[in-house]
Interface confidence: low
């Protein structure tokens, strides 16, 4: 999947299986990524687990789990708030669009999470105070925590290079260099560009991600995934000057 | 061990003379001792990762608070934390920091925080 980190680095990761996105004293988020096509290196998120840790007088530990074709509007125990404590309503799940869009607000830690199902796969976005991000017991054992450190270099796909290589060509040309098997022949580069431009008029990294996804999979739902990801940034990012990210040299993952 | 949970426990035991079932007229003192105990555990949280006594204490304080109808707010023998503990190496960073009014949004408890964003989508 495409990852925008807490430090506004933008990466395309081929990480497969379960990986931690966030892990601190209050919140743990883990994603499971699966290949989008058999044999493909490109992966998308098929499962998401969010654990809101027990927080003294405010909330009981609550676990939220979403999977492909299952975007519940409740925690795994069936509740929609933080439990029986007097501050339980400082953690709330709201269903925005049934089966497609859920928002979780954890007021006690100033955090908003948006989970969507777009096509077969899930998207995730969070707004969280730096103070909460930094509330970890032991920095040295934090390991690979994607939102903070990004993907390991050997798990990144340089999709910007594919974007450059494929301008004016069809999917057949991309397939030779692509991390995925040949996408449907009926999806030329020009069509991908047109479909992405329709939803993402600014040629930023979200637009480029959209083009990459369409050429890699032939699945038009990925257009919407990029569109909603940008919409979520508009809602959640505190720096309005950083909504759009533009092409630049690929970052090394953070320490 | 740098984890000072046993010190917190013994201070609590001294303060309550080893009694966990005080007479009703002792309850204010017992609750004050519990709040001091809670504060002590928060202060040592950072160095108590994986320590059984620490995690047992955190849960037990909550149990005892409710058993004896102690309010979270009230006198202690030490100053109290009302905010999320600061980041960095502060001794007061904690597993389960206390916020007095969960319902109020986060920035009521500290200066307006710097927010940050992370997102994951597509392939």
């Amino acid at each position: 999947p495409h990852l925008r980190t807490f430090t506004d680095r933008f990466q395309t990761c081929k990480v497969q299986g379960a990986w931690p996105l966030i892990d601190n004293n209050y919140l743990n988020v883990q994603v499971t990524n699966t290949p989008v096509l058999p044999g493909s290196a490109a992966t998308a998120t098929s499962k998401l687990t969010i654990i809101f840790k027990n927080f003294q007088e405010c909330v009981d530990q609550k676990v939220y789990q979403a999977e492909m074709d299952e975007l519940p509007a409740a925690f795994v125990d069936g509740s929609k708030n933080g439990g029986d404590k007097h501050g339980a309503n400082s953690l709330k799940i709201t269903e925005k669009v049934s089966g497609q869009h859920v928002e979780i607000r954890a007021k006690y830690i100033g955090t908003t999470i948006v989970v969507r199902q777009v096509g077969r796969y899930l998207t995730f976005a969070v707004r969280v105070p730096e103070e909460v991000v930094n509330a970890v017991e032991d920095w040295d054992s934090q390991g690979l925590y994607l939102c903070l450190r990004g993907c390991p270099l050997n798990q990144q796909i340089d999709f910007q290079a594919f974007h450059t290589n494929t301008e004016g060509t069809g999917a057949r040309r991309l397939a030779a260099a692509s991390p995925a098997p040949t996408a449907p022949e009926t999806f030329p580069y020009e069509t991908a560009v047109a479909k992405c431009k329709e939803k993402l008029p600014v040629e930023d990294l979200y637009y480029q991600a959209c083009v990459f996804d369409l050429l890699t999979t032939g699945d038009v739902n990925f257009t919407l995934a990029a569109y909603y990801a940008l919409e979520d940034v508009k809602m959640l990012h505190s720096n309005k000057d950083k909504l759009h990210l533009y092409e630049r040299t690929r970052d090394l993952p953070g320490r | 061990s740098p984890c000072k949970i046993l010190k917190c426990n013994s201070e609590f035991w001294s303060a309550t003379s080893g009694s966990h079932a005080p007479a009703s007229d002792d309850t204010p003192e017992f609750c004050a001792a519990l709040r001091s105990y809670a504060l002590c555990t928060r202060r040592t949280a950072r160095t108590c990762r994986g320590d059984l006594a620490y995690h047992s204490a955190v849960h037990g304080i909550e149990d005892l608070m409710s058993q004896h109808n102690c309010s979270k707010d009230g006198p202690t023998s030490q100053p109290r934390l009302h905010t999320l503990p600061p980041a960095g190496d502060s001794q007061e960073r904690s597993d389960s920091p206390e916020i007095c009014h969960c319902e109020k949004s986060f920035h009521k408890h500290s200066a307006t925080p710097n927010y940050t964003h992370c997102g994951l989508f597509g392939d």
């Epitope: 840790k53 027990n54 530990q61 | 061990s1 320590d51 047992s56 204490a57 849960h59 037990g60």
Partner: antibody, heavy 120, light 109 residues
Framework: EVQLVQSGAEVKKPGASVKVSCKAS????????ISWVRQAPGQGLDWMGW????????NYAQKLQGRVTMTTDTSTSTAYMELSSLRSEDTAVYYC?????????????WGQGTLVTVSS | QSALTQPRSVSGSPGQSVTISCTGT?????????VSWYQQHPGKAPKLMLY???KRPSGVPDRFSGSKSGNTASLTISGLQAEDEADYYC?????????FGGGTKVTVL
Amino acid sequence: EVQLVQSGAEVKKPGASVKVSCKASGYTFTSHGISWVRQAPGQGLDWMGWISPYSGNTNYAQKLQGRVTMTTDTSTSTAYMELSSLRSEDTAVYYCARVGSGPYYYMDVWGQGTLVTVSS
Amino acid sequence: QSALTQPRSVSGSPGQSVTISCTGTSSSVGDSIYVSWYQQHPGKAPKLMLYDVTKRPSGVPDRFSGSKSGNTASLTISGLQAEDEADYYCISYAGTDTLFGGGTKVTVL
């Protein structure tokens, strides 16, 4: 009723791994730690380690470090203990036990035990 | 060898009192409030009898009592009964280690 129900007996070859489960019911799983204790035939009790379902923190007996892994699944209120590189001296009954919550420390509820036999 | 030392066995007639000792160091027993005692009948799981040196969980008869002096914790069974015949283990929590005694076989004569 507070209960811990463990998985059935296992027979393993030396060098293999075993994973024992312990399903909790009748209480809030995340409010108490789970300890694992083993007892070799005719011997005393031997503490293996502890896990907090609340935080995921673990605390293993020094002599088992590197061979034992304790995990929990809060969605099913189940604790797991995996022991690798088994040797004949690991033959024992393995118990899970709930750790009493609080400034109190004790093991107040025990599973029925799982016999693990390591034999070639 | 266990970190806490218990006598291998003690015995007494019905109605008598028996005391089982559990000796450790100042850090494992002397300074610890976390000493607990467990009863185990053959083929059964252990059962908590006392915790935090002196406290009795509900359901445990009051003939079981605990004390501590220096680096030695003790379990006393007063008014011994036939069903008290079992193995008894002490446990102390010290730092991040849980220490077991080797166990004491109580025989009712």
